[in-house]
Structures are given as C-alpha cells and as structure tokens.
Amino acid sequence: PGPPPGPPRVSPDPRAELDSTVLLTRSLLADTRQLAAQLRDKFPADGDHNLDSLPTLAMSAGALGALQLPGVLTRLRADLLSYLRHVQWLRRAGGSSLKTLEPELGTLQARLDRLLRRLQLLMSRLALPQPPPDPPAPPLAPPSSAWGGIRAAHAILGGLHLTLDWAVRGLLLLKTRL
C-alpha cells in the first residue's frame, strides 16, 4: 500500500483567506448596525433587551489578546449559526410590524449565510479540525405579542452587532500573528 494520505493541503496564503473573511465580517457588521439603527428609529428601545436563546457573548477586552485561531473560528461559526436561526425565525414569526424591515432582513440573512460558508471554507483550508455536526436545536417559540417580536429583534440585532465587532477584532489580531 502507498503512503498514508497526508493532511489536507493548506492554502498557499492563509493571511489572504483570513483577510477575505475579515472583509465579509466587516460588511455584515456595517449592515447589522444600519439595520439596528433603522429598527430603533421605527421602534425605539427602552433599555437593553435580552433573549435567553441567544448565544452568550464571547467577549471581554482581555480575552481578545489570548485568542487562538481554531477557537475563534469554531466559536464564531457556532454563534453565527445561532444568529442565522434567530434571523430566520424573526422573518417568519416576527409579525407584521417587522415586515417594514424587509428586504433588509432578507439581505442580512443571505450575508450571514455567505459568511458561514466562508468560515467553513477557511477552516478546511487551514486544515483545522471540523466541528461535529450541530445537534438539532429546539424550535424557538413564537413571540407572545407584536411588542415581543420587536423586543426580540432588538436583542438579536444588538447581539449580532456585538458578536461581529468581537469577530472583526479577533480575526484582525490573529491575522497579524499568522
């Protein structure tokens, strides 16, 4: 028998791969901030809104300095999958009030999906261990009222906005170490 198969071939320039992922993340961050501002204009938020089903924010200023690439990409992918699911849920169950955020919510969903594919590609190009398939998530309960849908939208966009900023910073720091 021939030699055992080697590890997957690493991309010639991992910095370039990481760079295009950073740019996609930045675009999505800008879109999210704009959409969150639009939501706040239409439905002003009183205080912070939380949603128990959203991922816990993976950030602290100190933690940014200690990041490692596999951990960042795995965590980011898991969190963004959760946000994708929440955006889909919001579009489906958010009620007529949130229809005023279309087509922007649809664009956001498409860009989130694109970034997730990009992360998957980056992980395989960098020969990082692939995370196990995601267990099926329990379905999200529909909002109890129209205002509940709006509060959920504030929480989802606010959390995504923070997650993406953390991701951009983390990825940029990691790029300098490659």
Partner: antibody, heavy 119, light 111 residues
Framework: EVQLQQSGPELVKPGASVKIPCKAS????????IDWVKQSHGKSLEWIGD????????LYNQKFKGKATLTVDKSSSTAYMELRSLTSEDTAVYYC????????????WGTGTTVTVSS | DIVLTQSPASLAVSLGQRATISCRAS??????????MHWYQQKPGHPPKLLIY???NLESGVPARFSGSGSGTDFTLNIHPVEEEDAATYFC?????????FGGGTKLEIK
C-alpha cells in the same frame, strides 16, 4: 447635537504620562467605536487605535503599541487615551473621533487636545 | 501599511471653477462590496470634517458640490463650483486594512 468634547492643552515633562478624556454626547455611546488620531504640527494624520465602548475591545496601530492605552467609562460616556514615556516626538494635537463600526471612517471629531512635551 | 499619495500638494482654483484632488493607494482598497476610501476637509485650528465616505457617499450636511469617485487604487475628490469657504486642506483616508492611513494632504487656495 452630536459632540465629542476634549480637554484643554497639556504641557508635560519628558518621561511623564498624560491621560486625555473625550466625552461623548448626543448619540448612543455604545453604537460607535471611539478612535484616536495624532496630528503633528503641519503634518498629516496618524491613526493610533480604537476602542469599542460596549466591552472595551481595542485595536492599536503597531506604531503606537506600548505608547498609547485606550479605555472607556460607559457610565459617563467618556473615552480616555493615556500616553506614556513622553518625548518631544509625542508633541502633537490628539483627536478622538467617532468611528463607524466595521468601516473605520470618522464622522464626528473631537475638538482636539494639544500635548506639548518640554522640560 | 497602505501608503496614500495625494496630488497635487497644493492648488489654486478660481471661484466657481472645478477643483480636482487625486489620491493613489499603494494597493487596491476596493472589494466586491465597498471601496474603503474616505475624504476629509480641515481648516486651520479645527478638526477634520468628513465629506465623503466609502469612495462616493456624501456625508449628511455636506454640500452637493463635493463628490467622490474611483475604485481600486485611484480616487478623486471633485469640488464644483468652488466657493470661498472651501479654502482648506483635504485628506484622503483608506480603511481597507488596519491601520487606516491618511494621505499627506492637498491645500486648496481660492483665487
């Protein structure tokens, strides 16, 4: 009205430190980064770094790592930049600016703080 | 770091005429989504003021006589018709990579 208010001029001795405040008003402080920019006399502008007021995440220009430290106090909507081990090279006007998340352009600028390093 | 070269370093334009300022980047600052180039105006003793962001978007409150264009490595700021109050130094800035950098500035004088 959206404003970034900075403190008055600072005259400091070589080797000393200085901490410059930048107080934001007229917008949601956590919606934007606060960036810091240096302008030496009659020269162009240099980006020092930025901070996200939500959780204090920072990014620095490699040139200013170890020279500048950025912090925020969310409760007072104030960002700070501390400059240490000052030399005559650090004599400049320092601006804080509101940075668009993810895009790094600066749509609102502070009044500027002149730092003069002299013995 | 990406180097931005502005030209000319200074120019004098008659009132009502067109002022054209160029900014060339040492590598492309454009992607499929955005061109990460921005323009500022600075008057003596004052902070810079954002005029144009992402190559061609006019900042709110900035007069329509200011316009930006370009992609890749070559960008232009146009002012037409030039007014007395436009006498200032103009800077380009990219944000394609970190650190963002600024051009050396172009001083506009009104004849």
């Amino acid at each position: 009205e959206v404003q970034l208010q900075q403190s008055g001029p600072e005259l400091v001795k070589p080797g000393a430190s200085v901490k410059i405040p930048c107080k934001a008003s007229g917008y949601t402080f956590t919606d934007y980064n606060i960036d810091w920019v240096k302008q030496s006399h009659g020269k162009s502008l240099e980006w020092i770094g930025d901070i996200n007021p939500n959780y204090g995440g920072t990014l620095y220009n490699q040139k200013f790592k170890g020279k500048a430290t950025l912090t925020v106090d969310k409760s007072s909507s104030t960002a700070y930049m501390e400059l240490r081990s000052l030399t005559s090279e650090d004599t400049a006007v320092y601006y804080c600016a509101r940075g668009e998340l993810g895009h790094w352009y600066f749509d609102v600028w502070g009044t500027g703080t002149t730092v003069t390093v002299s013995s | 770091d990406i180097v931005l070269t502005q030209s000319p370093a200074s120019l004098a334009v008659s009132l009502g005429q067109r002022a054209t300022i160029s900014c060339r980047a040492s590598k492309s600052v454009s992607t499929s989504d955005y061109s990460y180039m921005h323009w500022y105006q600075q008057k003596p003793g004052h902070p810079p003021k954002l005029l144009i962001y992402l190559a061609s978007n006019l900042e709110s409150g900035v007069p329509a006589r200011f316009s930006g264009s370009g992609s890749g490595t070559d960008f232009t700021l146009n002012i037409h018709p030039v007014e007395e109050e436009d006498a200032a130094t103009y800077f380009c800035q990219h944000s394609r990579d970190l650190p963002p950098t600024f051009g050396g500035g172009t001083k506009l004088e009104i004849k």
